[in-house]
Interface confidence: medium
């Protein structure tokens, strides 16, 4: 080993060196949080870049650059360091038009903390491992969601467009002429029945166990879907989103109530099955895989 390499190895394995890098990263993160940084912070930025460059040079001199098994670029954690340095010099010395977009990559410096703190390294390692192991569970989840989305599509397509429409029309008014002239929320409230405080017209259905309209109103299928048109089973993609919402239990009771009002109470069976299989089983299966991966990484 050359004297330069010996010195580099000594520096690299020294605990003070790790401490210096950790402190640098944390200080850098503090500076990054500043709203309107003063002019002198520019010099501090250069100092940080210098320390990161020094760290990488020490690692390259001690371990080699890329040829050989344990060299600098063979460790994925060093890829992050390399990218951070490259972007630091790019944003500083190369005129690249929209620099603000490139400046975003400075945030990657915060991720350097992971490679320095051993506990964090373990957790992130487990996270990456769990993502690899999750592929099968993800395929199963997407498959199950797709199957239920197709069932939902067949059962509820167009149902959420059912609305309670006012009976007393003017002589020459038609549903089409009304829908063409409706512009504001106020116009809609004139013709459709709204519950107090609701932003969507009251849903209804044509089956005996679905929601009925109050006196003076008839159930019609017209207009857009609830929640600005985002809640529906009208296409596979919207149905898939609705099923994902059920699986994650994201305000799912609202979707459940809307659908049951428009389609009928019998369809609660569909929701019971989806919640049990999707929300209780699949979500916990995902958590189990993550837990297993973390356990393996710890060992």
């Amino acid at each position: 080993f050359s004297p330069l390499r010996r010195i580099s190895i000594k520096i690299l394995v020294h605990s003070l060196f790790s401490m210096l890098i950790m402190c640098t990263i944390l200080t850098n993160c503090i500076f990054m949080t500043m709203n309107n940084p003063p002019d002198w912070t520019k010099n501090v930025e250069y100092t940080f870049t210098g320390i990161y460059t020094f760290e990488s040079l020490v690692k390259i001199l001690a371990r080699g650059f890329c040829v050989g098994e344990f060299t600098f670029l063979r460790d994925p954690w060093n890829w992050l360091d390399f990218v951070v340095i490259v972007f630091a010099y790019l944003t500083e010395f190369v005129n690249l038009g929209n620099v603000s977009a490139l400046r975003t990559f400075r945030v990657l410096r915060a991720l350097k903390t992971i490679s320095v703190i051993p506990g964090l390294k373990t957790i992130v390692g487990a996270l990456i491992q769990s993502v690899k192991k999750l592929s099968d569970v993800m395929i199963l989840t997407v498959f199950c969601l797709s199957v239920f989305a197709l069932i939902g599509l067949q059962l509820f397509m167009g149902n959420l467009k059912h609305k309670c429409f006012r009976n007393s029309l003017e002589n020459n008014e038609t549903l089409e002429s009304i829908m063409n002239t409706l512009e504001s929320e106020e116009d809609f409230r004139k013709y459709f029945y709204y519950l107090e405080g609701s932003k969507d017209a009251l849903l209804c259905g044509f089956s005996t166990d679905s929601g009925q309209c109050p006196e003076g109103y008839t159930c019609v299928k017209i207009g857009r879907n609830p929640d600005y048109g985002y809640t529906s089973f009208d296409t596979f993609s919207w149905a898939f989103l609705a099923l994902f919402r059920l699986m994650t239990q994201d305000y799912w009771e609202n979707l459940y109530q809307q659908t049951l009002r428009a389609a009928g109470k019998t369809y609660m069976i569909f929701f019971v099955v989806v919640i049990f299989l999707g929300s209780f089983y699949l979500i916990n299966l995902i958590l189990a895989v993550v837990a297993m991966a973390y356990e393996e990484q710890n060992q």
Epitope: M157, K161, Q212, E215, T218, V220, K221
Partner: nanobody
């Protein structure tokens, strides 16, 4: 395509009765609301009566107590007209708000009209 066909019109003496019927032909998934309108010569079209699937019924003030609207389980609506007066002379139209197919929107459909003449 959905079509509404009216029948039962004709000439009747004042005080007489007529029964108009309207049937929907073609693909009909769901009938939401059926109504009878009339247009007397030189006048605007006006609502006579309507019936909804829930049994909600309404009549124009001029025909209350004399006319009766009803619908059956099939795609038909009827207008029973009693104690007819000369001012009831008009072209009677049937109108329905209906959904032709399960995935289509509710639309407004009109019949061609049937003429009712009340004259002595």
């Amino acid at each position: 395509e959905v079509q509404l066909v009216e029948s039962g019109g004709g000439v009747v003496q004042p005080g007489g009765s007529l029964r108009l019927s309207c049937a929907a032909s073609g693909p009909v998934f769901n009938i939401n609301r059926m109504a009878w309108y009339r247009q007397a010569p030189g006048k605007q079209r006006e609502l006579v009566a309507y019936v909804t699937p829930t049994g909600d019924i309404s009549y124009a003030d001029s025909v209350k107590g004399r006319f009766t609207i009803s619908r059956d389980a099939s795609k038909r609506v009827y207008l029973q007209m009693n104690s007819l007066r000369p001012e009831d002379t008009a072209l009677y139209y049937c109108r329905a708000l209906l959904q032709p197919r399960r995935y289509s929107n509710t639309r407004t459909y009109w019949g061609q009209g049937t003429l009712v003449t009340v004259s002595s």
